[in-house]
């Protein structure tokens, strides 16, 4: 068997002792004779002594005893024990009581033999067996005074044989995890929960997780059980990003031919139906009306132009009605109205000329005269010495109810080469070089133009009362919307609710879906955040897509291009939402087209503005934009850009 | 494009009679009567009244009336301004400027100086 | 007949200076007032017609204000080539009447 060099060392030395004992007893006699009964020299003692090592650690102590307890002949017995335990140097013990086994005294040193697990001069130090192999623990070495032992990791127990470790279970215990799932795992074990729920150790269960306060959401979060969901200012022309947590621009997908023509007028720029141009006409010389310009328009009803004074003096109003020129004549307070013509909102430029003559107003169409109209009096009135014609186009400079008979003044149509009076217009030239929102596109098409930056609204009710039901209303909201969109992103129609703030219904574009985490192009119908339907739509290929949405009592549907879309909730959660929509409905609500006020960007899974061509049918009524409360001045009523064609 | 051009500078004794040219183009002329504007010299603008190009009627202000005589030309697109018996404080340059309630074109000027 | 009232008679200012020149009617002539600007042997050019109105080609540092009987022009940011006379033309009634003009010099 082979030992350790250190415990080999240990071993042999007290055998090598042994040797020399008879030696050391002879010694002892010897310095009894020569030191302790008599005085002796450092000569005498090294003779005892056989060496110099011992002999210069005897020698001083020895003359201390003499100097403690006198001389030998004073025969004090303490000397004589002083001097006889001068060559043990294990007397007093130097070794370390805890770790030593036995001392051995040398020649003028001592040697200290230690137990296991001790070691060092004195045997006072502890010898860390954890260093070596880890002490021969397969998991954890604990080392202690003269001593060591293993243990094992949490989730683990010590075997039998003390050294080695084996896993726990402690899925075992069907309370480890509680409600949560337990997976044991080695030396451990797991509690799993669902994506988007995490464990709590306190009540043993599976807890959501609120994404919302990890700032995973660029903008707006919001956390649902299990899951989150991040919205973007769709209002500040923004979306989801492919990450569905980042924003980023909604850009078009499809390019609109909106260049505008720096040489022409846009009638309908102002909604609250005031002038797009109002001109003052002032001359010393008696002077007639004569005006000509190019017009074009889809919009079949609105205000051409006036001239004359003010509201109940002399004026005439050209105006259009059913897509035929109407002229309102007021002369001396009588007034009259005539229309008589072609249709003239085929959009293509015709040239329409006004023409006062002696005593009569000629109006022509492409210089063919439409109206001849007999008139006692001149448009220009002469006040302190100065004849005056005020001029406005695209609007009337009092309130339309003040008309002979009235008429919607809203007119989206184009002017172009225009001559007021025989003069040249620099004026209205310039004005409109620097204002492309004066100008027209130069080239349009029927529909209307939602541009992404606004939107409209009209006052409807859905509630009905049928003949047959008697007092009991009914509801219903039946839209069908013809779009081509230039942006895969907006909504097309809404409803709102002022005094709530809610959006009870909406019908948008979006590209993703917002529960599967997915980017797709769809068409959404939703009572107010909670998607009903999703049709998937093919938005950016330029072409015309049909939006169908019907809602009433118990169903709700969604058609894109006739085919039908896929329901998202349940039946008895669409009775909920319906109801809650029903409630909406029988409170004041408006009607929104392309676009939502500034609601929380939380109230409908789309906020952002429609944009391209769109018309919208609402119960079986075409809604003329001319006719909203409202409508953003970019907003074109009756006409549309086409989509720019394809590069060659 | 529009343009008024007036005759060139005349040097008359007191006395004298002066008549000024002032010819249009660029417009239809009896569509805007014209004006006359007189301007001594380091003074100030003066309307001296107007013409009427459709009927030749002429109107002047109150300091104007007696000496001055307004007249057209009006196949030759032109409007005159006739001075008799010329006097000193009648040196100054006269204008003929269109009349569109205020004047936007005007002529160069015809400097007319009155000395013995 | 509209007798109008311009002053300064003359002003001195330095570039970058604003200028203001004011025009008081004898009797209320709406907004119907109009301004010109004179330089030496030219015919006088309208630079703000009635309503406040700039008129095309005229710099924005131009402008004016009034209604009824007192009416301002203001020149921002004086330029060198703005030396010149300017005069009120109230354009309400006949006679028509001018201001008596104001010589603007740069120091």
């Known amino acids: 068997a082979l030992l350790p060099a250190r415990e080999a060392t240990q071993f042999l030395r007290p055998r090598q002792r042994r040797a020399f004992q008879v030696f050391e007893e002879a010694k002892q006699g010897h310095l009894e004779r020569e030191c302790v009964e008599e005085l002796c020299s450092r000569e005498e003692a090294r003779e005892v002594f056989e060496n110099d090592p011992e002999t210069d650690y005897f020698y001083p102590r020895y003359l201390d005893c003499i100097n403690k307890y006198g001389s030998p002949y004073t025969k004090n017995s303490g000397f004589a024990t002083c001097v006889q335990n001068l060559p043990d140097q294990c007397t007093p013990n130097p070794c370390d009581r805890k770790g030593t086994q036995a001392c051995q005294d040398l020649m003028g040193n001592f040697f200290c033999l230690c137990k296991a697990g001790w070691g060092g001069r004195l045997c006072d130090k502890d010898v860390n067996e954890c260093s070596q192999e880890n002490g021969g623990c397969l998991q954890i070495c604990h080392n202690k005074p003269g001593s060591f032992h293993c243990s094992c990791h949490s989730g683990f127990e010590l075997s039998s044989d003390g050294r080695t470790c084996q896993d726990i279970d402690e899925c075992a215990d069907s309370e480890a995890c509680g409600e949560a799932r337990c997976k044991n795992l080695p030396g451990s074990y797991s509690c799993l929960c669902d994506e988007g729920f995490a464990y709590s150790s306190q009540e043993k269960a599976c807890r959501d997780v609120d994404e919302c306060l990890q700032g995973r959401c660029e903008q707006v979060c919001v956390n649902s059980p299990g899951s989150y969901t991040c919205h973007c200012d769709g209002r500040g022309g923004l979306k989801l990003s492919q990450d569905m947590d980042t924003c980023e621009d909604i850009l078009p997908c499809v390019p609109f031919s909106v260049a505008k023509s720096v040489k022409s007028l846009y009638l309908g720029r102002m909604f609250s139906g005031t002038p797009v141009i109002r001109l003052r006409f002032k001359r010393l010389q008696p002077t007639r009306l004569v005006a000509e310009f190019d017009f074009r328009t889809f919009d079949p009803e609105g205000i051409l132009l006036f001239a004359g004074g003010h509201q109940d003096s002399t004026w005439i109003v050209l105006a259009l009605r059913a897509g035929r020129l109407e002229l309102q004549l007021r002369y001396n307070g009588v007034g009259r109205v005539t229309s008589s013509g072609p249709v003239i909102n085929h959009g293509m430029w015709q040239t329409i000329s006004v023409e006062e003559l002696a005593r009569n107003l000629v109006i022509k169409v492409n210089r063919d005269a439409v109206m001849k109209i007999a008139v006692a009096g001149d448009l220009f009135q002469p006040e302190r010495g100065l004849y005056h014609l005020n001029l406005t186009v695209g609007g009337i400079p009092f309130h339309e109810k003040d008309l002979v008979q009235p008429i919607n003044p809203r007119l989206d149509g184009c002017m172009r080469s225009w001559n007021w009076l025989n003069g040249e217009d620099t004026t209205i030239q310039e004005t409109v070089k620097v204002n492309t929102r004066m100008q027209c596109f130069s080239v349009t098409e029927r529909g209307s133009f939602y541009p992404g930056s606004g939107f409209a609204f009209y006052s409807l009710d859905y509630m009905r009362t049928p003949l047959d039901v008697g007092t009991e209303s009914t509801w219903e909201v039946e839209v069908v919307a013809h779009i081509r969109p230039a942006a895969d992103t907006g909504v097309l129609f809404a409803l709102w609710a002022p005094d709530l703030r809610a959006v009870p219904l909406s019908v948008a574009l979006v590209d993703y879906h917002s529960t599967k985490k997915l980017k797709k192009q769809l068409v959404v119908l939703a009572v107010e955040h909670t998607a009903l339907a999703l049709m998937e739509i093919k938005v950016c290929d330029g072409q015309e897509h049909v939006v169908t949405v019907s809602l009433r009592d118990g169903e709700a549907t969604l058609e894109v291009d006739g085919t039908r879309g896929q329901s998202e909730v349940s039946a008895a959660q669409l009775q909920e939402r319906l109801a809650v929509l029903e409630r909406h409905l029988r409170s004041p609500v408006l009607t929104f087209a392309g676009g939502l006020p500034d609601v929380p960007v939380t109230s409908a899974p789309v906020t952002a503005f429609y944009r391209g061509c769109m018309t919208l049918e609402v119960n079986r009524r075409l809604l003329d934009l001319d006719e909203a409360a409202y409508k953003h001045s970019d907003i074109t009523a009756h006409s549309c850009p086409p989509v720019e064609p394809a590069a060659a | 494009q529009i343009q008024l051009v007036q005759s060139g500078p005349e040097l008359k004794k007191p006395g004298e009679t002066v008549k000024i040219s002032c010819r249009a183009s660029?417009?239809?002329?009896?569509?805007?009567?014209m004006n006359w504007v007189k301007q001594a010299p380091g003074k100030g603008l003066k309307w001296m009244g107007w013409?009427?190009?459709?009927?030749?009627?002429?109107t002047y202000t109150e300091e104007f009336k007696g000496r001055f005589a307004f007249s057209l030309e009006t196949s030759a697109t032109t409007a005159y301004l006739q001075i008799n018996d010329l006097k000193n404080e009648d040196t100054a340059t006269y204008f003929c400027?269109?009349?569109?309630?205020?004047?936007?074109?005007w002529g160069q000027g015809t400097l007319i100086t009155v000395s013995a | 007949e509209t007798t109008v009232t311009q002053s300064p008679a003359s002003l001195s200012v330095a570039t970058g200076e604003k200028v203001t020149i004011r025009c008081i009617t004898s009797?209320?002539?709406?907004?119907?007032m109009n301004w010109y600007q004179q330089k030496p042997g030219e015919p006088p050019k309208l630079l703000i017609s009635?309503?406040?109105t700039l008129r095309p080609g005229v710099p924005s540092r131009f402008s004016s204000s009034g209604y009824g009987t007192d009416f301002v022009f203001t020149i921002e940011n004086t330029l060198s080539e703005d030396v010149a006379d300017y005069y009120c033309?109230?354009?309400?009634?006949?006679?028509?009447?001018f201001g008596a003009g104001t010589k603007l010099e740069l120091k």
């Open positions: 009797t209320d002539i709406d907004d119907d």
């Open positions: 660029g417009y239809t002329f009896t569509n805007y009567g």
């Open positions: 013409i009427n190009t459709n009927t030749g009627e002429p």
């Open positions: 400027a269109r009349d569109e309630g205020w004047f936007v074109y």
């Open positions: 009635e309503g406040n």
């Open positions: 033309l109230q354009t309400d009634s006949v006679p028509l009447t």
